[in-house]
Interface confidence: medium
């Protein structure tokens, strides 16, 4: 009986690509489309609502005709039925144009990133050789939070030219081992920038910066907000003195109050003396007291 | 199994319109494909429009083209057809189908609506 089923029915032959089709059996699709019609049409297959089921048909005979991996002209048209391929479809794929880039995440956009989806900006990237301007500005305006799912290794491709695709949301995942290799790369980028705007371009990559760049933008009245230096490294932040915090903060001192429980200010307070604190007149408690002696032991440990 | 429940048919006059919906439920997910068909006394059941499981692709009778749209809300499970400037032959019995196979093989039927075009 299976047997009978392979032959195509007479005059159901698919001369082209259309809605008729979704009217087929899945073996008469099977025996009545040719694949290398299919290849040619595959920019017809989106428009017309083929089943979930057919859509396996369709697939299979594209896998058979392309055993390799589907050429980029396939690959760009392919709609929806890109959600049919599995990550090792995807890995036997050359995707060069951020043009079909674009096409495929277009059929994911509003789901989370999907294991397809992961692997094929993989391949694209490493098909590039490095996160250019454009592919950082297609994938964040896609996925906000991509940036921040590479790791250090592969955030140290992205050349600074491709910072100024970043918004300050892409960052809001990252954390501190990200910032410590963006930061450098953000200074590089926005270097000919005068201070105020140098500053508003700089400030979300800021949880990488180190201490004496905190304390060169102290110098520059940047009025930095409580959020962003809730986001400093800790061992960026201890070394500043009360006069640089609070020039760094400016009329934003005043919620240190706030947050003296928690990092980094709870740590920095503790490494201030009490005194000193007291001249921010915020009621900051923890300092070190009067006549105490402050050594510092990471010198010590350095000459040792 | 998968239910359909159609609703929003109704006595309308020629030139105006109706909103049917259809909602699915027990083992159904966004990969079925949902159409409408319809039935009117003594003709045989005909398809009008199909929606794909994406929402993307949809298909149209000739005879409905530019005068009724098939949209779906996946969170929902519900399937809709708008239908405006309806004429006297729209009157039939619309059913909502659901198939992740073809419409031919496998598919799910509701029990169907009225719907009526008459002054």
């Known amino acids: 009986r299976e047997v009978e089923k392979t032959a195509c029915p007479s005059g159901k032959k698919a001369r082209e690509i259309d809605e008729s089709l979704i009217f087929y059996k899945k073996w008469e699709l099977e025996a009545c489309v040719d694949a290398a019609l299919l290849a040619t049409q595959m920019d017809r297959v989106n428009a017309i609502p083929f089943t979930y089921e057919q859509l396996d048909v369709l697939k299979h005979k594209l896998d058979e005709l392309y055993p390799q991996g589907y050429p980029e002209s396939v690959i760009q048209h392919l709609g929806y039925l890109f959600l049919k391929m599995s990550p090792e479809d995807i890995r036997k794929w050359n995707v060069t144009s951020l043009e079909t880039l674009k096409a495929l995440l277009e059929v994911n956009k509003g789901h989370e990133m999907s294991p397809q989806v992961a692997t094929l900006i993989d391949r694209f990237v490493k098909g590039r050789g490095q996160l250019d301007k454009d592919t950082l500005d297609t994938l964040t305006a896609f996925y906000p939070g991509y940036l921040c799912s590479l790791s250090p290794e592969e955030l140290s491709s992205v050349p600074p030219s491709s910072i100024w695709a970043v918004r300050p949301q892409d960052l809001d995942t990252c954390d501190p081992r990200q910032l410590d290799v963006l930061y450098p790369k953000a200074r590089l980028a926005f270097q000919n920038m005068n201070g105020s705007e140098y500053f508003v371009k700089i400030q979300s990559f800021l949880g990488g910066a180190p201490t004496e760049d905190l304390k060169a933008l102290s110098q520059q009245n940047v009025s930095m907000d409580l959020a962003t230096f809730m986001k400093l490294r800790t061992d960026a932040v201890l070394p500043l003195t009360v006069a640089e915090v609070q020039k760094l903060l400016g009329p934003h001192v005043e919620g240190l109050k706030a947050e003296e429980r928690h990092r980094p200010v709870r740590d920095w307070i503790l490494r201030q003396r009490q005194d000193d604190l007291d001249t921010l007149g915020l009621g900051l408690q923890g300092g070190i007291p009067n006549g105490y002696l402050v050594l510092d032991l990471s010198m010590q440990e350095a000459l040792s | 199994q998968v239910q359909l429940v159609e609703s929003g048919g109704g006595l309308v006059q020629p030139g105006g319109s109706l909103r049917l919906s259809c909602a699915a439920s027990g083992r159904t997910d966004s990969t079925y494909n949902m159409a409408w068909f319809r039935q009117a006394p003594g003709k045989e059941r005909e398809i009008v429009a199909v929606?794909?499981?994406?929402?993307?692709?949809?298909y149209y009778a000739e005879s409905v083209k530019g005068r009724f749209t098939i949209s779906r809300d996946n969170p929902k499970n519900t399937v809709y057809l708008q239908m405006n400037s309806l004429k006297p032959e729209d009157t039939a019995v619309y059913y909502c189908a659901a198939t992740r196979t073809s419409w031919t093989e496998n598919t799910y039927w509701g029990q169907g609506t009225q719907v009526t075009v008459s002054s």
């Open positions: 929606i794909n499981w994406t929402g993307g692709g949809t």
